[in-house]
Every structure is written in structure tokens, then in C-alpha cells.
């Protein structure tokens, strides 16, 4: 008599997560009498997937009626496949006995599950950095299978090249994760810039998944300071202006000091935005020259986004002050330089 064969025609089957998988198995003979069982994996640790005679297998149904006389088709259908169902499935024939004895196994069918990657999540640096500095952005996506995946970074219409990408785990797994880090050199114009992380995978086909991060969350643009004196007024008052320009974010405190003493403190709020996303702010201080016997040292002190204060100082010479001043004089454009105004 011919030896019984257990035939699993497909070496591998690939199914999308959520779909049903059909695992085919036929036997070449009805003899000897005994049941067929399905297992995932081989050896002592194998997992029973389906046994017609006993057990509860809610996601597994036989393809043909196993109670039918002369049935030789023991194919099964597993519904609502998840990545955890991946593995090699064996159709195994047993000889009836007490207990049943394993007689022959099919060659096995490897079930791989195609699962979509999760939407990429992009995270930026914890603290802001200034122009010319390099900051890192990280992009993560999880739960995809198979392992092959493409990840690209973009900024302002260009693909980024300073990128390091890892797919984990390195070995075989039911699903995989990708983590990529892109290093970006900031410029003063980056307040409105965006970085985009794009993930392409076989399951996505027509459209990739993208995650974005705004560089406005990562950048600090420190202000330029300029202090100017407007012309002397008839009432011996001098109007001094502190222009704070091209800064981001808006969080800024300005303090006027007269001879080292705090004269006034202001907080920037509801400023109009420049085209490049930065802000400008102008503060005025009226100094009554006739109320001073000696020269007045004026300081405009700016604290931006929790950074150390930046000062611009100059002296108003009281001694030889003419009644009408026709000049428009600026303080030197460096930290604590003083400028004498006559």
C-alpha cells in the first residue's frame, strides 16, 4: 500500500493584517484512521491551532466539511489575522490510539502578515537653539511588516542627508519599528520652516505616511538692539528709543535703567509678526534733562526667552546741552558700549 502523504502546497502565504488566511492541506489516503491537527511551530513547544475533535478555536474554521465521508481536505481559514499570527503552520496526521500517535507532518506553510506602519511621530529638541547650531529631530513608526521600509526626511523642499536610521529588531519578528534621527543646521530664516519625515512601505502603496515638526519649536533668534536719541524737545525732554528687532520667540522683557536704577520694565505681547516669523519691538523713554545735574547713563536691558540679559547703554551729557538738538544718534551696536550724546 502507498505511504500516506500530508500535502501543504504553499511554502508561504502572505496576508494583510485584518484579512483571513487560508492554509491548505490535503492527505493522499484515508488510511490509517486518525485525526488531523494544525500546529504553529515545530518541536515540543509547538502551539495547537486547530483540532476538529476538541477545543475551542473561534478564529479557525475548516474550509471543507471535515465530517463528510471520505474527506481528504483539511485546509483551514484563520480570520482577522494580526502580526502575532505570523509563523510556520504544520498540518499533522495522527494514528488513532490511546493516545493518538503522530504519524506524518506536512512540510509547513509560513504565514507572514503584512501590517501598515503607524503614523510617523516626529519629536524635536528639548531646548531651543540659535542659528548656525545643529539640532536633532527624531521620527518613529511602529508595527509594520514586512521589514523593508523607506524613510526620508525633508526640509524646505530638499531631502536631508545627515540622517541615521535603524529598523528593529534586526532578526525575524512578527512586526518591526523604525527610528530615524535627522540633524538640521538652523538658520535665522527657519522660524517658518518645517521638517517632514516620510515613511513608504509596501502596505501603503499609493500614498506614504508623513509626520511633521515645526522648527519654530526648536529655534531661538536672538534680538538686535539699537538705542537712538530723538531730537531735544523745547521742554528739555529727550526721547530715547530702544529698537529690538528680528527676535523669536516673542517672550521678551525690556528694562530701562537710569544711572543703574530701574526706571521701567515692559513685557512684549501681541506683537505683529514679520514676514520671516520674527518680531520687532520699540520702547521709548522720556528723559527730563533739566532734572539732572550730572550726565545720565541710560541702559536698555533685554531678556529674551530666559537667556542672559543683553544691554545697550549710552550717556546723555547734561552739562553743555543745547536747547535744540537736531541729531538722531545711535548707541554702538555692541553689548555694554556707552555712547556720549552732546
Amino acid at each position: 500500500e502507498e505511504e500516506l502523504q500530508v500535502i501543504q502546497p504553499e511554502k508561504s502565504v502572505s496576508v494583510a493584517a485584518g484579512d483571513s488566511a487560508t492554509l491548505n492541506c490535503t492527505v493522499s489516503s484515508l488510511i490509517p484512521v486518525g485525526p488531523i491537527q494544525w500546529f504553529r511551530g515545530a518541536g515540543p513547544g509547538r502551539e495547537l491551532i486547530y483540532n476538529l475533535k476538541e477545543g475551542h478555536f473561534p478564529r479557525v474554521t475548516p474550509v471543507s466539511d471535515p465530517t463528510k465521508r471520505n474527506n481528504m481536505d483539511f485546509s483551514i481559514r484563520i480570520s482577522n489575522i494580526t502580526p502575532a499570527d505570523a509563523g510556520t503552520y504544520y498540518c499533522v496526521k495522527f494514528r488513532k490510539g490511546s493516545p493518538d500517535v503522530e504519524l506524518k507532518s506536512g512540510a509547513g506553510t509560513e504565514l507572514s502578515v503584512r501590517a501598515k506602519p503607524s503614523a510617523p511621530v516626529v519629536s524635536g529638541p528639548a531646548v531651543r537653539a540659535t542659528a548656525e547650531h545643529t539640532v536633532s529631530f527624531t521620527c518613529e513608526s511602529h508595527g509594520f511588516s514586512p521589514r523593508d521600509i523607506t524613510l526620508k526626511w525633508f526640509k524646505n523642499g530638499n531631502e536631508l542627508s545627515d540622517v541615521q536610521t535603524n529598523v528593529d529588531p534586526a532578526g525575524k519578528s512578527v512586526s518591526y519599528s523604525i527610528r530615524s534621527t535627522a540633524r538640521v543646521v538652523l538658520t535665522r530664516r527657519d522660524v517658518h520652516s518645517q521638517v517632514i519625515c516620510e515613511v513608504a512601505h509596501v502596505t501603503l502603496q499609493g500614498d506614504p505616511l508623513r509626520g511633521t515638526a515645526n522648527l519654530s519649536e526648536a529655534i531661538r533668534v536672538p534680538p538686535f538692539l539699537e538705542v537712538t536719541q530723538q531730537s531735544m524737545r523745547a521742554d528739555n525732554q529727550v526721547n530715547v528709543t530702544c529698537q529690538v528687532t528680528k527676535f523669536y520667540p516673542q517672550r521678551l522683557q525690556l528694562t530701562w535703567l537710569e544711572n543703574g536704577n530701574v526706571s521701567r520694565t515692559e513685557m512684549a505681547s501681541a506683537l505683529p509678526e514679520n514676514k520671516d516669523g520674527t518680531y520687532n519691538w520699540t520702547s521709548w523713554l522720556l528723559v527730563n534733562v533739566s532734572a539732572h545735574r550730572d550726565d545720565v547713563k541710560l541702559t536698555c536691558q533685554v531678556e529674551h526667552d530666559g537667556q542672559p540679559a543683553v544691554n545697550k547703554s549710552f550717556s546723555v551729557k547734561v552739562s553743555a546741552h543745547p536747547k535744540e538738538q537736531g541729531s538722531n544718534t545711535a548707541a554702538e551696536n555692541t553689548g555694554t558700549n556707552e555712547r556720549n550724546i552732546y
Epitope: 523607506t150 526620508k152 525633508f154 516620510e198 513608504a200 501603503l204 502603496q205 506614504p208
Partner: antibody, heavy 120, light 107 residues
């Protein structure tokens, strides 16, 4: 070699249904998206949407939501475009086109086109 | 939706001419731009993808350039078989959108 072969021309009366087929060969059908493009007589190309051949999901451009449907017969490597309740303005040539792979989602191979004329 | 604008709907050219066809996107499309050639009665044929990559079998007289929102298709020396309508198409976002087309005609 890769080929997309579409069904022949159709003449329909307003209100009828038309179904166009696009048979793919030379590649694994379920690995690539299938797009549909409309070209009215003397006009330019208009993207209608695409079908994910693996998951069966359909994406339709705004102008093609409602009466238009994309179908698949995966076992026959065939994609279908069905237009219900056809109108005169549906008179056009319809193309199927394969979506590229990886991050190059360009339409790289096209069917020869199917002419649909709607006339009472 | 991203609008694609081909400024010239038709061009009258002489054989051997250098031809430049422009295409402008309403927003950044990150080089996800394709150029197609369509001859009367035929399906479109992909010439260039990724704004600059020439497809296999496309003559080297064709080239693509550009970035951001502005892209160009160039033909260095026009041949008889190049007489056709050329379409640009963005595939950065859905819906995919085509330019209106530029028809090349011989003077």
C-alpha cells in the same frame, strides 16, 4: 514585460452603468497601486483616484465621489472602474495606470485607454 | 489641492530647436514631479520622475530640472517624434494633480 490592457470602447445612454476593466501582467498585481485618470475629448488629464490592490481601500478625488467605484478581481490581476448613472459629461477616455513603488509614487505604466461615449 | 500651472498651452517650434516647458506648483512639492508625453490617440508615457530622473528608454535629449515650486522640462534638439502634448504632474499629495498640458507644434 509589464502591461496594462483595458477593455474596449463603450457607448452608453444616460442613466446606464459602464464597467471598464484593466488587466495587469508582468508584475505582482497586489504590490502596486492602481490609479484611474480621465481625459475628456480635447482636454487634459484628470486624476480620479486610486485603489490599494492589497487592502482593497479606494481613494477618490473630490469630483469622482459618488457615482464612481473602483473594484478588484485579485485572482485575475484585474482592476475595474464602474460609473453608475452615466451622464453626458462622463464622455471621455479613461486610463488605468500603475502606481510606482517605494517612495516614487509616480504612475509608471499606463493602459491604452477606454473610450466611453454617453449619448441619448 | 495643489494647483499645477503650465504657463504655455502651446508652442510653435522648429525641428532642432531647444525647447523649455515650465511647470509651477502652488506649494512646495519636494521634487515629487513627473513629466508625461502624450501623442494623439495614445496613452501618456512617463518621461521623468522625481523632477530629474530620466525613465529607461527615454532619449537623453530630454531632461528635467527644478525644485520647490518651479520645474522645467527641456528638449535639447527637437525631433519629429517629439511633437506631442507634455503634462507635468505632482505626486507629493493627494489628490494628484496635472498641469493643463503644453502642446508642441511644428512651425
Amino acid at each position: 514585460q509589464i502591461q496594462l490592457v483595458q477593455s474596449g470602447p463603450e457607448l452608453k445612454k444616460p442613466g446606464e452603468t459602464v464597467k471598464i476593466s484593466c488587466k495587469a501582467s508582468g508584475y505582482t498585481f497586489t504590490d502596486y497601486a492602481m490609479h484611474w485618470v480621465k481625459q475628456a475629448p480635447g482636454k487634459g488629464l484628470k486624476w480620479m483616484g486610486w485603489k490599494n490592490t492589497e487592502t482593497g481601500e479606494s481613494t477618490y478625488a473630490e469630483d469622482f465621489k459618488g457615482r464612481f467605484a473602483f473594484f478588484l478581481e485579485t485572482s485575475a490581476s484585474t482592476a475595474y472602474l464602474q460609473i453608475n448613472n452615466v451622464k453626458n459629461e462622463d464622455t471621455a477616455t479613461y486610463f488605468c495606470a500603475r502606481g510606482g513603488y517605494g517612495s516614487n509614487y509616480v504612475m509608471d505604466y499606463w493602459g491604452q485607454g477606454t473610450s466611453v461615449i454617453v449619448s441619448s | 489641492d495643489i494647483q499645477m500651472t503650465q504657463s504655455s498651452s502651446s508652442f510653435s517650434v522648429s525641428l532642432g530647436d531647444r525647447v523649455t516647458i515650465t511647470c509651477k506648483a502652488s506649494e512646495d512639492i519636494y521634487n515629487r514631479l513627473a513629466w508625461y508625453q502624450q501623442k494623439p490617440g495614445n496613452a501618456p508615457r512617463l518621461l521623468i520622475s522625481g523632477a530629474t530622473s530620466l525613465e529607461t528608454g527615454v532619449p537623453s535629449r530630454f531632461s528635467g530640472s527644478g525644485s520647490g515650486k518651479d520645474y522645467t522640462l527641456s528638449i535639447t534638439s527637437l525631433q519629429t517624434e517629439d511633437v506631442a502634448t507634455y503634462y507635468c504632474q505632482q505626486y507629493w499629495n493627494s489628490p494628484r494633480t496635472f498641469g493643463g498640458g503644453t502642446k508642441l507644434e511644428i512651425k
